[in-house]
């Protein structure tokens, strides 16, 4: 009982004057509160309360459920308590089976006793299974058993409160512990595609996958630099305990150009936040953009190979591709493939493989591509470099020596005179006339050059060399002269290839 200090309000006194009282089931509970300023009795068990305004609390036939704390309070707010145990061999525990634990926190198994004189008040696993080795608990007969520092591994642990009564173990009803995990990492977020390209009116749909330990994770789709609420749909799954997955799908049923922008999937928990973005580009119509991977003017040596390569962006997907030369379509020698296997790829590569090109195969090679919205083309001008070929070398009636050579690039013709029998022709002779002739072949073909010198300048026997050359090579033709009296005679002309 409380001690009284004169002049100060004192707490009420309770009869019987003990802190704990044990009664048998069926017996009477009679508690008297003495205080001039009596206000109420309060009864509390399993954290539920009942009140009584009578100063004497009487329960004629006590039941196990009358076990609990009885508190008398006066008008000064001072109180005094007695704890009553109603001993019932058939009901040793009062229980509230709701049992939730937060990871790393303590949680109370609410199984207060109706008899404080039983022994070995503890927890036991269901069906004889042992409790986890690291599970620690503190029993309190008036409240229950406190599990210390709940672990994630205890989730859905089945247990009983247990006591020994007269040498026998008695178990309470089952409790199933539901553990709420602590967030110890940020959510994991991913998006179905990093970028989307659509035409106006098409549906935009993107899915964000959020993974975390529980469904308490928060997630939302946001449009960057906008407060507009976005319409989302959700699917979620628990892949076993503490492995939660949510799919948040954002849909714009008919996308417009001004819907273009960056969309962010944001998720957070008490540990932190994570986000991932996707970019939407909406175009009013499809497009094709072609990028040559080599110069569109191509020079290649006779007999060599060349690859004409383009990359192109096409949206929607390309439907027809072809390579054309001289109004003829190539059926083979070319390949077309996507630049990447990525689902959102819009970039493609096309390669035309030209092998052992002849001088006659120069010209315009055109790549054409189309999709459902547009057509596009690119042309390559291919020049085949050929060493000069001397087409004609003649002594004309007017006494001129004429040499006609063809090649690409345009050949240069030089003339040389070798007196007598000398093999080396070093003395150069200036031409009288040089002309570039129009080729009768296709454009991009060989260029024809005609050069003439006046043979009357030669007064001695010897050889005249016509030498045609360009970047690729050179070719010579020779005129042999012999004087018989006053007459100059052309002996058989011949050509000599000089590499």
């Amino acid at each position: 009982q409380p001690s009284v200090s004169p002049g100060e309000p004192s707490p009420p006194s309770i009869h019987p004057g003990k802190s704990d009282l044990i009664v048998r089931v069926g017996d009477e509970i009679r508690l008297l509160c003495t205080d001039p300023g009596f206000v109420k009795w309060t009864f509390e068990i399993l954290d539920e309360t009942n009140e009584n305004k009578q100063n004497e609390w009487i329960t004629e036939k006590a039941e196990a459920t009358n076990t609990g704390k009885y508190t008398c309070t006066n008008k000064h707010g001072l109180s005094n308590s007695i704890y009553v145990f109603v001993r019932d061999p058939a009901k040793l525990f009062l229980v509230d089976r709701s049992l939730y634990g937060k990871e790393d926190n303590d949680t109370l198994v609410r199984c207060p006793l109706t008899d404080p004189e039983v022994t070995n008040y503890s927890l036991k696993g269901c069906q004889g299974k042992p409790l986890p080795k690291d599970l620690r608990f503190i029993p309190d007969p008036k409240a229950g058993i406190m599990i210390k520092s709940v672990k994630r591994a205890y989730h859905r642990l089945c247990l009983h409160c247990s006591v020994d009564q007269e040498g026998k173990s008695v178990l309470s009803e089952k409790f199933i512990l539901k553990v709420r995990p602590a967030f110890k990492a940020v959510p994991v977020v991913s998006v179905s595609k990093a970028s989307y390209l659509l035409r106006e009116g098409e549906e935009f749909t993107v899915t964000c996958t959020i993974k975390d330990v529980s469904s308490s994770v928060y997630s939302t789709w946001k449009r960057e630099n906008s407060q507009t609420k976005l319409q989302e749909k959700y699917n979620s799954w628990h892949h076993g305990d503490f492995n939660y997955e949510r799919q948040a799908t954002l849909t714009i049923s008919s996308a417009r150009v001004n819907d273009s922008g960056v969309f962010m999937c944001y998720a957070n928990n008490t540990f932190g936040s994570a986000n991932v973005t996707t970019t939407l580009e909406v175009v009013d119509k499809g497009f094709i953009n072609i990028f040559p991977m080599i110069n569109t003017t191509v020079f290649v040596n006779d007999g060599e190979n060349v690859d004409l390569i383009v990359e192109y962006e096409a949206f929607p997907k390309p439907e027809h591709q072809q390579w054309i030369y001289m109004n003829r379509t190539f059926t083979d020698k070319w390949e077309d493939y996507p630049k990447s296997e990525n689902e959102s790829n819009i970039r493609y590569v096309s390669e035309l493989h030209l092998t052992r090109l002849k001088g006659t195969e120069g010209g315009t090679y055109t790549f054409l591509v189309s999709n459902s919205d547009v057509n596009a083309a690119i042309a390559f001008n291919v020049y085949v470099n050929t060493k000069p070929e001397i087409l004609t070398y003649d002594r004309l009636v007017n006494g001129m020596l004429q040499c006609v050579a063809a090649g690409f690039p345009e050949p240069t013709i030089d003339w040389y005179f070798c007196p007598g029998t000398e093999q080396r022709c070093s003395a150069s002779v200036l031409p009288v006339d040089v002309q570039t002739l129009n080729s009768s072949g296709p454009p991009f073909g060989k260029l024809v050059v005609q050069s003439s010198i006046d043979s009357s300048a030669f007064k001695h026997n010897g050889t005249v060399e016509c030498k045609a050359y360009n970047d690729v090579g050179k070719t010579s033709a020779y005129f042999n002269f012999a004087f018989k009296g006053n007459n100059k005679e052309q002996i058989h002309p011949h050509t000599l290839f000089t590499p």
């Epitope: 509390e44 309360t49 709701s98 937060k102 089945c158 469904s215």
Partner: antibody, heavy 117, light 111 residues
Framework: QVQLVQSGAEVKKPGASVKVSCKAS????????MHWVRQAPGQGLEWMGV????????SYNQKFKGRVTMTTDTSTSTAYMELRSLTSDDTAVYYC??????????WGQGTLVTVSA | EIVLTQSPSSLSASVGDRVTITCRAS??????????MHWYQQKPGKAPKLLIY???NLESGVPSRFSGSGSGTDFTLTISSLQPEDFATYYC?????????FGQGTKLEIK
């Protein structure tokens, strides 16, 4: 004698927020989980979420994600449920319910929230 | 989420009739022998009232004509002899897994 007494009816405009209160008595407020359930006119019951005893942790039905916040004021033994960005679909009676021994043993009388332009 | 499907959706019966309402869950709501399935009664303009908890336990103060049975995914609420005050809507509810869910309800009407 456990009692849950809820705040009165509310009329709100679309886009606004509402905060419903639930004052508890007859038990130790911090020892029991408080759930919120709503019922649209002529429709069934829909669980919105729970605020757990002690820690004040919450778990929400994902349908209401980002729009709902559940809180408590332990000094007055009152639970609150705030719902934001209201639309006409949120017109409903909102109930608080105390979880006891695995079930919803005690319910508030309900709060009608009408969302109308 | 666990989907609960009640049948029938509505039912006409007379005072004194025996009535059975079923609730089927899309997945089991059992754990360690407990079925986390409960039954509630709701009258117009009133809050739901708990009748049966953990599938078969009668809530204190509820008349004994109400009973519940079942486990796993199939559950039944039975009213052995209908009384006039029993005409109401009945809901099953699971709290084995979040989000907790309710059946769509069974409206019991006077024939």
């Amino acid at each position: 004698q456990v009692q849950l007494v809820q705040s009165g009816a509310e009329v709100k405009k679309p886009g606004a927020s509402v905060k419903v209160s639930c004052k508890a008595s007859g038990y130790t407020f911090t020892s029991y989980n408080m759930h919120w359930v709503r019922q649209a006119p002529g429709q069934g019951l829909e669980w919105m979420g729970v605020i757990y005893s002690g820690s004040g942790d919450t778990s929400y039905n994902q349908k209401f994600k980002g729009r709902v916040t559940m809180t408590t004021d332990t000094s007055t033994s009152t639970a609150y449920m705030e719902l934001r960005s209201l639309t006409s679909d949120d017109t409903a009676v909102y109930y608080c319910a105390r979880e006891r021994d695995t079930r919803f043993g005690n319910w508030g009388q309900g709060t009608l929230v009408t969302v109308s332009a | 989420e666990i989907v609960l499907t009640q049948s029938p959706s509505s039912l006409s019966a007379s005072v004194g009739d025996r009535v059975t309402i079923t609730c089927r869950a899309s997945e089991s709501v059992d754990i360690y022998g407990y079925s986390f399935m409960h039954w509630y009664q709701q009258k117009p303009g009133k809050a739901p009232k708990l009748l049966i908890y953990l599938a078969s336990n009668l809530e204190s103060g509820v008349p004994s004509r109400f009973s519940g049975s079942g486990s796993g995914t199939d559950f039944t609420l039975t009213i052995s002899s209908l009384q006039p005050e029993d005409f109401a809507t009945y809901y099953c509810q699971q709290n084995n897994e979040e989000p907790y869910t309710f059946g769509q309800g069974t409206k019991l009407e006077i024939k």
